[in-house]
Amino acid sequence: EVEKTACPSGKKAREIDESLIFYKKWELEACVDAALLATQMDRVNAIPFTYEQLDVLKHKLDELYPQGYPESVIQHLGYLFLKMSPEDIRKWNVTSLETLKALLEVNKGHEMSPQVATLIDRFVKGRGQLDKDTLDTLTAFYPGYLCSLSPEELSSVPPSSIWAVRPQDLDTCDPRQLDVLYPKARLAFQNMNGSEYFVKIQSFLGGAPTEDLKALSQQNVSMDLATFMKLRTDAVLPLTVAEVQKLLGPHVEGLKAEERHRPVRDWILRQRQDDLDTLGLGLQGGIPNGYLVLDLSMQEALS
């Protein structure tokens, strides 16, 4: 806590300018009016204050706004944002996307800090949902943002926002997250024609159910192996050999290299060997002709 001392004669700040960098901490505290600072926050960023000096400026704002800063101040915090704690940020009410962008810019190039995570959380909660413009902004700064959300948080993403999602934004999503995002993507893209639809939906297919994979197999989509390997195992198991062949098109030959990995391995175990042989890939492990199929739950218990 900086001691309250009188401002030396002639040092009272009339405006926020470069002369203040020569002020000692106690002089800043005594000579800079908090209200002046609040109205001229946009100038702070252009002045090379030390970290200690920024601490004093933050302290002055905290005293002026004990319930949390107004958005007019928040928007111009600049590097002072890095001094904020998550507790400080929880007091804010940020509604403007411009404010969010300005603060994310300060943290650009760094990992998402607890401060940024809190800011985003406050902003999204304030808006009530993760709309397209917000998602556009967040994924531009943090491509992994979407996959950092819990399935519960993702459920607030409206289907219209899905248009903002790029394939790389989903790279680190796990199956539970894709389970939530896929139906939204399906709804968002369903007005497109078949081939355009597949291009858009492809990166979300890790959450697709069996029936949609079967429908895609009727569309000559030629799914690549990387996409196929990310599909839900339970969704792939009911696909017939003919359906997988149609789904993958020329990429079907890649099954051989993946025959020991999920979901290919488990899918092979559910197919008749005669059917697998029609692919001519030498896939082994299917059900011999005339054999009963054990229910999968029994197979699990036996292995």
């Epitope: 078949g194 079967k214 429908a215 569309q219 009911p238 559910r270 999968l296």
Partner: antibody
């Protein structure tokens, strides 16, 4: 919400024709495969016909092949079943149903109409 | 065409009892077998898709199993609202077909 409403049923003499309609709302009709399923009074379900989202492929049960024609008008969100050369055994409640998936004919969904009764009798 | 045979045709069960309905296909259909429930004067409702996948919103007491030619629908702890006719349905090959139905009555 999804709604399917059948109409066009009634009493008709053997050998005559009838056209059933199904008005769809609450979903993007042009993206879904559609089906007709029937149920004779006190009997089980019988799949009758299916059509792709764009009308490019049509499938029929053996019992109606050559007599019934399934069609759709995506601009009007309508599904149709033209039934010619009707027989007594065609007497049933006819349901229209949406496919569960988009861009294919894969599996009957949870969305069915309430049905329209067709009675073929002299 | 593929013929589906359900058994039993009729079952009278007391509430909380476990119900098992089987469906046998005349040829191999993989997992392309679905179960529907039809209550009197209502259109059918999808319960289980692809032999064992629960459809959204369906109570957890309904489960399905099987693959190939033999399939089972199980209702654990039957409730009064489960009184209905249950149909198995195959979408493995055209023409699609249904089983003849199993009527479940509450004692």
């Amino acid at each position: 919400q999804v709604q399917l409403v059948e109409s066009g049923g009634g009493v008709v003499q053997p050998g005559r024709s009838l056209r059933l309609s199904c008005a769809a709302s609450g979903f993007t009709f042009s993206s879904y495969g559609m089906h007709w399923v029937r149920q004779a009074p006190g009997k089980g379900l019988e799949w009758v016909a299916a059509i792709w989202y764009d009308g490019s492929n049509k499938y029929y049960a053996d019992s109606v092949k050559g007599r019934f024609t399934i069609s759709r008008d995506n601009s009007k969100n309508m599904l149709y079943l033209q039934m010619n050369s009707l027989r007594a055994e065609d007497t049933a409640v006819y349901y229209c149903a949406r496919d569960l998936s988009i861009f294919g004919v894969v599996i009957l969904s949870d969305y069915w109409g309430q049905g329209t009764l067709v009675t073929v009798s002299s | 065409e593929i013929v589906l045979t359900q058994s039993p045709d009729f079952q009278s069960v007391t509430p909380k009892e476990k119900v098992t309905i089987t469906c046998r296909a005349s040829q191999y259909i993989g997992s392309n077998l679905h179960w529907y429930q039809q209550t009197p004067d209502q259109s059918p409702k999808l319960l289980i898709k692809y032999a064992s996948q629960s459809f959204s919103g369906v109570p957890s007491r309904f489960s399905g199993s099987g693959s190939g030619t033999d399939f089972t629908l199980t209702i654990n702890s039957l409730e009064a609202e489960d009184a209905a006719t249950y149909y198995c349905h195959q979408s493995s090959s055209l023409p699609w077909t249904f089983g003849q139905g199993t009527k479940v009555e509450i004692k």
